[in-house]
């Protein structure tokens, strides 16, 4: 299983952008106009448009509501008036420069409409949705444009046990046969059109994809097994002339496999699908999110395909055929015998044309009664190594999108930004077969599942947003940014971020116009290509005698294993004297002179069967017997960012310039209060820092005081 | 017109091999299957194997697997049928034919073969 | 393999007369393919997919059936139909021919 996130941000810890409107709810189509810099939110009831730069800026707005009369006759046939029989938006595509087609489940009368976008007013066409978008907001859907038609997977009916595929064209509208070997009770994921390079020499057609999962019509078990599909239509199919008239002549369906090849694990419920192109790829792959069918532990799982394999088992594979043993029980075998010629399922390429099949239209009625009754391949689509990409256990994802980056060194990266139910999202690379979780993020505060996740391309201007029930946050690719040092920036293994020394930060590759010369990158980990630290910082406190005292170790890895060292000993937590807060910060329980001197936080990482070792930071305490008068008995205490609670703070300087400035200023009444401007803090947020290789001890002296002090 | 011509009957001893052809008019072998089908005198009918003449791909029955084997040349747009170590039982008449999806749809004429001393 | 078998294995019918042939399978097929022969000739294709009657094949005859039970019906023989018919699958290998029925004119 995957490890870990190496980090984790908290909601407030780093900057996202946040859109959400008052009493606006499911915030699921997401469209990215990436010329237009604008990013389209379907919700419930309206639709957003919004700066791609910044979500938070609103551009436009438009609302489609459901008339009362609409909502009182859903409410009639058993669904809730507060929620059911609304208008989810659950259809977001381009239809042209100037507008989109947007679909709404309208109260369970699906309805679609064009919205202009320079008015940003619907044109009132109130088309017929059935087919394209489904009645109920709880079923599922998928939809894609392809040259001005809509291609959508979703249900028929008001009770959504009519599934379809369909394509909604004025001149040749087509769906799937109603029939349990064509969809049986399908779960719609995804649907994408893969185009054919215009130089292609077979003269093949575009393709569209779609991503289901069903219950299995193969595999018979005492319970209905689900089974993960991936499906195609060729865009120029014209129907049947007779047998499969006004039907797709080209639907085909195959088994997706996920699963460990050492493991009876099986990964069998698809959740979403993305499909990565790049210029470096010839052929588009496709990354599809699992999780188990029974998943009582959590457990997901993501495998890479490339579509050449899919198209092979469309294009070459075996199919299969269903036989009725006894009554009413079917059982599905291989079909081993002639298939007939032209091969059923296939696109009107140049060698059917050749034959003088130019059209499906006039395919002969052998090859159009096989794909009626063989719509299943036998062969499965097996995914890139044979094993998935990723298993992570504790877990469970949502969604999926895979950007594709090259390191400083030119290897290329596929990252994976994979969401949670929880509002997380997982950012993870692979790493010579290994898996690497970068970070997790957590996206919304109110832990609440991640419905939609889109990824912007454009170069300098790299997001993803996520849409949840409550509202859409964008997220930059990297946080390299919080990456405080080059061992930091290094750790991550993040392909988007290196350490510049002249700045002396982490920055992000992708805003980096200058050339990469100087930039310090190692995706091993190898933190030793680090410059030298020349000097070592540390802090010095002055505690009183018989109190506690906590130092500060801020490592953010959840890899790593925080120790302390003490006169170069190696500090036991365990014992009445010592304790360990958060796992990371030193505790210091009856204060004596014996325990004045060089405290060292050390942190222990393993990277690529190597042990990497970081000095996170340094205390110099010594104890002393504090004078009375700079504490009151009744002193109330409030606690500072970096968790210290303080009287005063002296920030030493070691050029003795400018006199030091309080951090946190005692009032008279006992109070403590912040100044208006922070002081710089090292990454540990400690106040006071001393930069020298050698401790001095008779440097100016900071006071703290804990509240388990002078009691 | 499709037409599918068989080779003359055969007259062979027993423990010999002989090889029937079956040339196609009217249509092209790569775009079908041609399947052979053997009948015995006053018998019924016993499905020997089917070739794709496109791919040269084969299937036979499993009880005729060490007994016939099937080629075609799609250059002279005919398939043929090879039987070896004969016997009185595959004394018979061998059809060959064209067949899909929608059954054996086109027929030759058949070729007798006798096996005697 | 999947065994076919035809009943009855000879039957003959008087002109008019409606003649329903069956052909019983070991196993479920998806589809029956019927074939006439008559004596000297080659097999003629004759319903094929089950109930699709092929090219020149007279609308008198009709197919039927599914799973392991199929039939052919001829509505009103007539003295041309005498000859043998033979049921054969196309499910699995390998394809199988049923042992045929003769049909004669009374």
């Known amino acids: 299983f995957a490890p870990i996130p190496r980090i984790t941000w908290e909601h407030r810890e780093v900057r996202l952008v946040q859109f959400h409107e008052p009493d606006i709810y499911n915030y699921s189509a997401l469209l990215l106009s990436e010329d237009k810099d604008t990013l389209y939110i379907g919700a419930r009831e309206a639709v957003f448009a919004v700066n791609a730069l910044n979500i938070s800026e609103k551009q436009h707005e438009v609302y489609w509501k459901v008339s009362e009369d609409k909502k009182a006759k859903c409410a009639e046939k058993g669904k809730s008036k507060q929620t059911e029989c609304l208008n989810y938006i659950r259809v977001l595509q381009p239809l042209s420069a100037t507008s989109l087609y947007v679909c709404g489940t309208n109260a369970f009368q699906p309805a679609c409409d064009h919205l202009n976008l320079t008015s940003f007013k619907f044109l009132g066409k109130n088309e017929d949705g059935k087919g394209r978008c489904p009645f109920d907001p709880a079923h599922s859907y998928t939809s894609v444009m392809v040259d001005g038609e809509l291609y959508s997977g979703t249900s028929y009916n008001f009770l959504g046990s009519e599934p379809i595929i369909s394509r909604n064209s004025s001149h040749s509208p087509l769906r799937t046969e109603y029939a349990i070997p064509w969809l049986n009770e399908p779960s719609f994921v995804f649907a994408d059109v893969i185009r054919k390079s215009p130089d292609s020499p077979d003269g093949e057609d575009d393709r569209v994809y779609f991503f289901f999962t069903e219950v299995s019509v193969e595999y018979e078990f005492v319970f209905r097994v689900l089974i993960p599909r991936i499906a195609r239509v060729c865009k120029g199919d014209q129907g049947g002339l007779r047998t499969l008239q006004k039907k797709w002549t080209s639907f085909l369906k195959a088994r997706l496999i996920c699963s460990r090849p050492d493991s009876s694990l099986v990964f069998n419920v698809l959740r979403d699908v993305f499909v990565l192109r790049s210029p470096g790829l010839k052929v588009p792959v496709f990354y599809a999110l699992f999780t188990p069918q029974l998943n009582n532990v959590g457990l997901s799982a993501v495998c890479a395909y490339n579509l050449s394999i899919a198209e092979e088992v469309f294009s070459h594979g075996k199919y299969m055929q269903s036989a009725t043993v006894e009554q009413s029980h079917t059982k599905w075998v291989r079909y081993n015998g002639p298939v007939p010629k032209p091969r059923p399922g296939a696109c009107i390429d140049s060698e059917a044309r050749a034959a003088n099949y130019t059209s499906s239209l006039n395919l002969p009625d052998k090859t159009l009664q096989f794909v009626k009754d063989h719509p299943l391949m036998d062969d499965s689509v097996t995914p890139i190594d044979n094993r998935p990409r990723l298993i992570k256990k504790d877990v469970n994802y949502t969604q999926i999108v895979v950007d594709r980056t090259q390191a400083l060194d030119g290897t290329v990266y596929d990252v994976m930004f994979v969401s949670t139910d929880r509002g997380a999202l997982h950012k993870a690379i692979s790493l010579e077969h290994a898996v690497h979780i970068i970070e997790e993020t957590q996206l919304f505060q109110d832990f609440e599942p991640v419905q939609t996740l889109l990824l912007s391309s454009k170069k300098g201007r790299r997001f993803v947003y996520a849409g949840s029930n409550s509202g859409v946050v964008q997220a930059p690719l990297a946080f390299c940014g919080k990456h405080g040092t080059c061992e930091d920036c290094v750790l991550a293994r993040d392909p988007y971020c290196a350490w510049s020394p002249p700045t002396a930060t982490c920055v992000a590759l992708y805003q980096t116009e200058s050339p990469s010369r100087g930039l310090v990158q190692e995706m091993s980990g190898d933190a030793s290509v680090c410059p030298d630290k020349s000097k070592g910082s540390y802090r010095q406190h002055f505690f009183k005698h018989g109190g506690t005292a906590e130092l500060k170790c801020s490592q953010k890895s959840n890899l790593a294993r925080v120790f302390w060292k003490f006169q170069n000993g190696v500090l036991k937590a365990e014992s009445p004297k010592y304790g360990l807060m958060g796992r990371k910060n030193l505790l210091i329980f009856n204060l004596s002179e014996g325990d004045s001197g060089v405290y060292q936080c050390l942190s222990e990482e393993r990277v690529k069967n190597k042990t990497v070792f970081q000095v996170v930071a340094k205390h110099v305490l010594e104890v002393k017997v504090v004078p009375k008068p700079v504490v009151a008995p009744t002193l109330s205490v409030v606690q500072t960012e970096g968790s210290r609670i303080a009287t005063k703070v002296l920030v030493a300087s070691t050029q003795g310039s400018s006199p030091p400035t309080p951090a946190v200023q005692a009032t008279s009444s006992g109070a403590i209060t912040l100044p208006p401007k922070p002081v710089p803090t090292s990454t540990s947020c400690e106040p006071k820092i001393v930069i020298n290789t050698v401790p001095q001890l008779h440097s100016e002296k900071t006071m703290y005081l804990k509240s388990s002090d002078n009691r | 017109e499709v037409q599918l011509q068989q080779s003359g009957a055969e007259l062979v001893r027993p423990g010999a091999s002989v090889k029937l052809s079956c040339t196609a008019s009217g249509f092209n072998i790569k775009d079908d299957y041609i399947h052979w089908v053997k009948q015995r005198p006053e018998q019924g009918l016993e499905w020997i194997g089917w070739?794709?003449?496109?791919?040269?791909?084969?299937e036979y029955a499993s009880n005729f697997q060490a007994k016939a084997t099937i080629t075609a040349d799609t250059s002279s747009n005919t398939a043929y049928l090879q039987l070896s170590s004969l016997t009185s039982e595959d004394t018979a008449v061998y059809y060959c034919?064209?067949?899909?999806?929608?059954?054996?749809?086109?027929w030759g004429q058949g070729t007798l073969v006798t096996v005697s001393t | 393999q999947i065994v076919l078998t035809q009943s009855p294995a000879i039957m003959s019918a008087s002109p008019g007369e409606k003649v329903t042939i069956s052909c019983s399978a070991r196993s479920s097929v998806s589809y029956m393919y019927w074939y006439q022969q008559k004596p000297g000739s080659s097999p003629k294709p004759w319903i094929y997919r089950t109930s699709n009657l092929a090219s020149g094949v007279p609308a008198r005859f009709s197919g039927s059936g599914s799973g392991t039970s199929y039939s052919l019906t001829i509505s009103s023989m007539e003295a041309e139909d005498a000859a043998t018919y033979y049921c054969q699958h196309y499910h699995t290998y390998p394809y199988t021919f049923g042992g045929g029925t003769k049909l004669e004119i009374k």
């Open positions: 070739i794709d003449p496109a791919n040269g791909h084969i």
């Open positions: 034919t064209t067949g899909d999806y929608d059954g054996f749809t086109y």
